[in-house]
């Protein structure tokens, strides 16, 4: 922690300027008034402070705003943002997308995924929902950041905004996030024709239920293997060999390459070997001929 000393009269600070780079840490602590610093935050980023000096300035702001910085200060943090922890950011109330853009630019190239995720979360809370302007800002300045949001936050995305989301924005989304986004996408794109619909819905299909995947198999969509591999295991297991063949079309040959990987491996184990043989791919591990298949999940549900 910085020692408290009194400020020498000749070192008194009346404005934030480049002369401060020559101040030692304890002089900055003693001579910079926190209220002055907050009022002139827009000047700080233009001054080549050392990281140690930035620590002092952060300490001053923390003392002045123990409940969290106001947005007027947050907007001008610049490289001081690199000093913020997720705990600091959690105290903020951010509504301006200009603030978000400024801080996303600063964070680029630095390992700040936790801080950025918390910042985006605060913006969504501050704005009340994940609206189109926010999504546009995220996709432009922080590809992949959409997936840093919790499923609870993503649930505030209106379906009308889904069209602004690009495939690469979903690359890092997990199943729980896609579970939230997929039904919104299905609603948003439902007025499109079959082929156009499939192109749009494809990046979201990791959240699709079995019946939607079955429906797609009737549409001659020729799903690529990469998309098939991202389908949830539970959505793939009930599909028949014929349905998978129709779903993948010419890409069905790719099943051989993915034979040992989930969900293909798990799906193979559920199929009759006779049925798998009809594909002519040499897939092995199906249920041998003559064996009886009991669907215990349905039996349990009925009991």
């Amino acid at each position: 922690d910085v020692e408290r000393t009194t400020c020498p009269p000749e070192k008194e600070v009346h404005e934030i300027d480049e002369s401060l780079i020559f101040y030692k840490k304890r002089e900055l602590e003693a001579c910079v008034d926190a209220a002055l610093l907050a009022a002139q935050m827009d000047r700080v980023d233009a001054i080549p402070f050392t990281y140690e000096q930035l620590d002092v300035l952060k300490h001053k702001l923390d003392e002045l705003y123990p409940q969290g910085y106001p947005e007027s200060v947050i907007r001008h943090l610049g490289h001081l943002f690199l000093k913020m922890s997720p705990e600091d950011i959690r105290k903020w109330n951010v509504t301006s997308l200009e603030t978000l853009k400024a801080l996303l630019k600063v964070s680029k190239g630095h390992e700040m995924s936790a801080q950025v995720a918390t910042l985006i979360d605060r913006v969504v809370v501050g704005r009340g929902q994940l609206d189109k302007d926010t999504v546009d800002t995220l996709t432009a300045f922080c590809p992949g950041c959409l997936c840093s949001l919790s499923p609870e936050r993503l649930s505030s995305v209106p379906p009308s905004v889904i069209g602004a989301v690009r495939p690469q924005d979903l690359d890092t989304c997990g199943p729980r996030q896609l579970d939230v986004l997929y039904p919104k996408a299905r609603l948003a794109f439902q007025n499109m024709s079959g082929s156009e619909y499939f192109v749009k819905i494809r990046p979201f299909l990791g959240g699709a239920p079995t019946e939607d995947v079955k429906a797609l198999s009737q549409q001659n969509v020729s799903m690529d293997l990469a998309t098939f591999m991202k389908l949830r295991r539970e959505a793939v297991l009930p599909l028949t060999v014929a349905e998978v063949q129709k779903l993948l079309g010419p890409h069905v040959e790719g099943l051989k390459v993915e034979e040992q990987h989930s969900p293909v491996r798990d799906w193979i184990l559920k199929q009759r070997q006779d049925d798998l043989d009809t594909l002519g791919l040499g897939l092995q591990g199906g249920i041998p001929n003559g064996y009886l298949i009991l669907d215990l999940s349905v039996r349990e549900a009925l009991s």
Epitope: S155, P183, Q190, M192, P209, T210, A215, S297
Partner: antibody
Framework: QVQLQESGPGLVKPSETLSLTCTVS????????WSWVRQPPGKGLEWIGY???????QSNPSLKSRVIISVDTSKNQFSLKLSSVTAADTAVYYC????????????????WGRGTLVTVSS | EIVMTQSPATLSVSPGERATLSCRAS??????LAWYQQKPGQAPRLLIY???TRATGIPARFSGSGSGTEFTLTISSLQSEDFAVYYC?????????FGQGTRLEIK
């Protein structure tokens, strides 16, 4: 074939929480989206919200602050909790299955439970 | 939210005649509209989806038309089992909303 059955108390006191369960039999709960819809006596239908087996939900904004929809895949059941009830929440509550077997599926219902009347009264 | 308005509230028609029920949306719902039939003490039954596609097992006398904001359900030749309450429902956006219903009664 798949059947739905609602269960829960038929009488709830004002300010308390209404709790209902829908049991899905004859098929897996994992294949579809599942909704709650209610109908006050002599009135029209109101969609409450849906749930996916993973727990992902969407609720009607008019009720959102009071609604919790949850799922128990091991029992093939999903549930509704509606807090701080008043007489205006007296209705027949239906669970329903959202259709998924259509090329570009829509949010409408091809299978319904028989419904259960819940009366809010002290 | 999208408000669905049905008219008339009650429609009296003789068996064998044609019945025409209307549903209007407060904003465009494209063709994302379903019709249901409900008899006393029973759950609703899906009749039509996509504004004009009959659900599985629904007789050909039921037909739907319209798009945007104006929709019609037509029953070409009323049978005794058709007298019930009919609801329209939009699924163009959340929250999903229903009309207040049209009661079809025997004249």
């Amino acid at each position: 074939q798949v059947q739905l059955q609602e269960s829960g108390p038929g009488l709830v006191k004002p300010s308390e929480t209404l709790s209902l369960t829908c049991t899905v039999s004859g098929g897996s709960i994992q294949n579809y989206y599942w909704s709650w819809v209610r109908q006050p006596p002599g009135k029209g239908l109101e969609w409450i919200g849906y749930i996916f087996y993973s727990g992902s939900t969407q609720s009607n904004p008019s009720l959102k602050s009071r609604v919790i929809i949850s799922v128990d895949t091991s029992k093939n059941q999903f549930s509704l909790k509606l807090s701080s009830v008043t007489a205006a929440d007296t209705a027949v509550y239906y669970c329903a299955r959202e259709v998924g077997r259509i090329a570009v599926a829509g949010w409408f219902f091809d299978l319904w439970g028989r419904g259960t009347l819940v009366t809010v009264s002290s | 939210e999208i408000v669905m308005t049905q008219s008339p509230a009650t429609l009296s028609v003789s068996p064998g005649e044609r019945a025409t029920l209307s549903c209007r949306a407060s904003q465009s719902v494209n063709s994302n509209l379903a019709w249901y039939q409900q008899k006393p003490g029973q759950a609703p039954r899906l009749l039509i989806y996509g504004a004009s596609t009959r659900a599985t097992g629904i007789p050909a006398r039921f037909s739907g038309s319209g798009s945007g904001t104006e929709f019609t359900l037509t029953i070409s030749s009323l049978q005794s089992e058709d007298f019930a309450v009919y609801y329209c429902q939009q699924y163009n956006n959340w929250p999903l909303t229903f009309g207040q219903g049209t009661r079809l009664e025997i004249k």
